[in-house]
Interface confidence: low
């Protein structure tokens, strides 16, 4: 059987490197090798590239190398497939080298802002050495912010006579690092160069973009003053590199601006001590170039009734995220504040918060939270300047078995009964939600029995024991990940009941 006719011939001219053709034969029943016949120098010369029948058989590709590559030129190419039964020839194909030329990428040597011109970067590059001198080159400039995965592109051309290998990229974000990469091609070619090595540049700094502001209301003190912990951070969308020199805070009771007090700080948190009335708090950040827009917060009066609109909340885990969803009876509320912090026996060391808009769910990457730690998560509805009642839940991103089992003791030992009590495991050692306790008990040389009780039970009365018998007993606390036994205790039932 003759070999299949070679089809889908595709050729590319890697400028001053090689001229390579590939093709796609159908699956061959028998061993096949190929010859590529070429005419070049505008038909003046001919040669053959062969995939011989020993080492290169069945490789549907051949390359012609310098010095037999001439440019500019038109080539004629025909591929022959050969096996033991004969030869099958492709259609003749024609190739203009200018249309299939691929050149080296350019080299970006600087990406810089221009003094006084905001939100612009000037890119300078070196035209590839291996590129035809007389040719107009077309370029694609790819750029992205340094922490983004998504590239944007802009296309332009440069005449060889320009000699000005620069491009001004405008309408960027202020004080942001951008990654740039550039490719080029002869204007007539369908093949682009590879991308240049990436280069980073930073746009000029401006006044701060803005702040997100939040608070924690603490119980009123004996003297009636209310501690309010203010906290703020760069607003979502602010340049990553933005740094504030400091923050100005001013606050006053509602309708009483002449009692305005001001504070300057370099921290991103500040504790205020307010009276029982409604207060308004304003914060701006500033740098050497100016101030941010004002962030405003209303602190409700001590006796103000806060609205309640969250009806239910669920926390669930996906493969790499914790997702919190809530249901609300107030369709007009479209902003929510989420707080989360570890539930520990002592004062929490880390407290985090984030605003959510136009959604009733919040997600966080699992790796931003510690495994085996319980987190308190609260969601506050925010309607204009009013903050409603929070709804809270708890979640683990990963449960483990408890680090310690319950400390157990035997009380009220009788003839056939005993009351077992145990202490709750400290929060830091639970490593998950305790879902139940299992009491394992065994008479000396006897069979082991067990009884499982709910996690809210810390005492259990065992009955139907044997009189005057030594028992060993331990209580296991279990999470979804498994259980951990507490200390083993021993007791002996009485021989006669004691009144």
């Amino acid at each position: 059987v003759l070999p299949a006719k070679p089809e889908n011939i595709s050729c590319i001219f890697y400028y001053e490197e090689n001229f390579t053709c590939t093709w796609s034969p159908e699956k061959e029943a028998s061993y096949t090798w190929y010859k590529v016949k070429r005419t070049y120098s505008y038909g003046y010369k001919s040669d053959i590239c062969s995939t011989d029948n020993s080492t290169r058989g069945n490789h549907a590709s051949c390359s012609f190398l310098p010095p037999t590559i001439t440019n500019p030129d038109n080539y004629t190419i025909q591929v022959e497939a050969q096996n033991a039964d004969g030869i099958m020839k492709s259609d003749i194909t024609y190739w203009n080298l200018d249309a299939i030329m691929k050149i080296e990428p350019p080299e970006i040597f600087s990406v810089k802002s221009v003094l006084g011109i905001k939100r612009m970067l000037q890119i300078k590059w070196i035209r590839p050495v291996l590129a035809p001198h007389s040719s107009t080159l077309k370029y694609t400039l790819r750029f992205r912010t340094i922490n983004s995965a998504y590239w944007m592109e802009v296309n332009f051309t440069k005449e060889d006579i320009d000699r000005d290998e620069t491009y001004n990229l405008t309408e960027l974000q202020a004080f942001t690092e951008y990654v740039m990469t550039l490719r080029c091609a002869p204007a007539e070619s369908m093949f682009w160069s590879g991308w240049s090595q990436e280069k980073v540049g930073t746009t000029e700094e401006e006044a701060p973009y803005g702040l997100d502001l939040w608070r924690v209301l603490k119980p009123a003190m004996v003297d009636g003053r209310r501690p309010v912990q203010l906290m703020w951070k760069k607003a979502t969308g602010a340049p990553v590199l933005e740094k504030a020199l400091g923050y100005n805070i001013w606050y006053f009771p509602e309708n009483n601006t002449n009692l305005t007090e001001t504070v300057n700080t370099t921290n991103q948190t500040h504790e205020l001590y307010l009276g029982g009335k409604t207060y308004w708090v304003y914060v701006v950040s500033y740098n050497s170039l100016g101030e941010s827009p004002v962030a405003t917060l209303r602190i409700p009066a001590l006796n103000e009734k806060t609205f309640q609109c969250i009806e239910a909340m669920q926390a669930c885990l996906t493969q790499d995220q914790l997702v919190v969803e809530w249901q609300s009876s107030a369709p007009e509320v479209d902003t929510w504040m989420v707080e989360w912090f570890p539930d520990v026996d002592s004062e929490p060391s880390s407290f985090s918060w984030e605003s959510v808009s136009q959604a009733r769910n919040w997600t966080i990457q699992k790796d931003e939270l510690k495994p085996l730690w319980c987190y308190n998560i609260s969601v506050y509805p925010v309607l204009r300047d009013r903050v409603g009642q929070p709804y809270s839940t708890q979640a683990y991103v990963q449960e483990g078995i408890p680090s310690a089992g319950p400390v157990t003791q035997a009380d009220s030992i009788g003839v056939k009964t005993v009351t077992i009590t145990w202490k709750e495991i400290p929060k830091s050692k639970r490593n998950g939600f305790i879902k139940n306790y299992t009491i394992f008990y065994q008479a000396e040389d006897g069979k082991e029995f067990s009884k499982t009780v709910n996690s809210n039970i810390l005492q259990y009365r065992l009955e139907s024991l044997t009189r005057r018998t030594s028992y060993s007993l331990q209580v296991m606390a279990s999470t979804n990940a498994g259980g951990t036994n507490g200390t083993k205790i021993n007791f002996k039932t009485l021989s006669i009941s004691v009144l």
Partner: antibody, heavy 131, light 108 residues
Framework: EVQLVESGGDLVKPGGSLRLSCVAS????????MSWVRQAPGKGLQWVSG????????GYADAVKGRFTISRDNARNTVYLQMNSLRAEDTAVYYC????????????????????????WGQGTLVTVSS | EVVMIQTPLSLSVSPGEPASISCRAS???????LVWYLQKPGQSPQLLIY???SRATGVSDRFSGSGSGTDFTLRISRVEAEDVGVYYC?????????FGQGTKVEIK
């Protein structure tokens, strides 16, 4: 039968040099890429260097860059690793490995795609760098 | 360089039970350039899986691979005694090529 036989491993002082050789048999040598991979005693695998079937260097691990050189002699079916300025942390079993074009699942159309993977390993030769 | 992190570092499995090894790359790796090897005690490594999910010739269909981007997984559907050894993932996508630190699989 496909075989890779390494030689040249020895005890050498820090700062010294060594040349490892790997002789291949049982396959058409110049159709394949070759790599050197090392394994320090009781430790994991570390790719050292590779050379493609055309004789182009694939690259070097950062730890050996500028000190080690890979080369091949297709006529002798041999790949070499020239190791200079040796350090104690270069102590390891050095494996020679063949990189073969293995076909992944068809990606559509009439084209088939092949990529190079290490599919055959030698038994290794021990290099000890110690004073 | 691309850092490959394997978890767990050791695994003790009863015969007939499934096992799973995770390999996480510090940056995205093309799935065609992700490979798994097994090094049995006292032996040279051997190729198990190439291109993330293709089994090498002669490898039991108990072994399977999956994943993309930065997260890849090797699964053994039913562990047998002959599967004991250290399993390594390796990326070929970016230079230098890098291995994971290895996962030791033992039989309970």
């Amino acid at each position: 039968e496909v075989q890779l036989v390494e030689s040249g491993g020895d005890l050498v002082k820090p700062g010294g040099s060594l040349r490892l050789s790997c002789v291949a048999s049982g396959f058409t040598f110049d159709d394949y890429g070759m790599s050197w991979v090392r394994q320090a005693p009781g430790k994991g695998l570390q790719w050292v260097s590779g050379i493609n079937w055309a004789g182009g260097t694939i690259g070097y691990a950062d730890a050996v860059k500028g000190r080690f050189t890979i080369s091949r002699d297709n006529a002798r079916n041999t790949v070499y690793l020239q190791m200079n300025s040796l350090r104690a942390e270069d102590t390891a079993v050095y494996y020679c490995a063949r990189e073969s074009p293995l076909r992944l699942g068809d990606l559509g159309g009439d084209y088939f795609y092949y990529y190079y993977y290490i599919d055959v390993w030698g038994q290794g030769t021990l290099v000890t760098v110690s004073s | 360089e691309v850092v490959m992190i394997q978890t767990p570092l050791s695994l003790s499995v009863s015969p007939g039970e499934p096992a799973s090894i995770s390999c996480r790359a510090s940056q995205s790796v093309s799935s065609r350039y992700l490979v798994w090897y097994l090094q049995k005690p006292g032996q040279s490594p051997q190729l198990l899986i190439y291109g993330t999910s293709s089994r090498a010739t002669g490898v039991s269909d108990r072994f399977s691979g999956s994943g993309s981007g930065t997260d890849f997984t090797l699964r053994i559907s039913r562990v047998e005694a002959e599967d004991v050894g250290v399993y390594y993932c390796q990326q070929y996508d970016q230079s230098p090529r890098t291995f994971g630190q290895g996962t030791k699989v033992e039989i309970k």
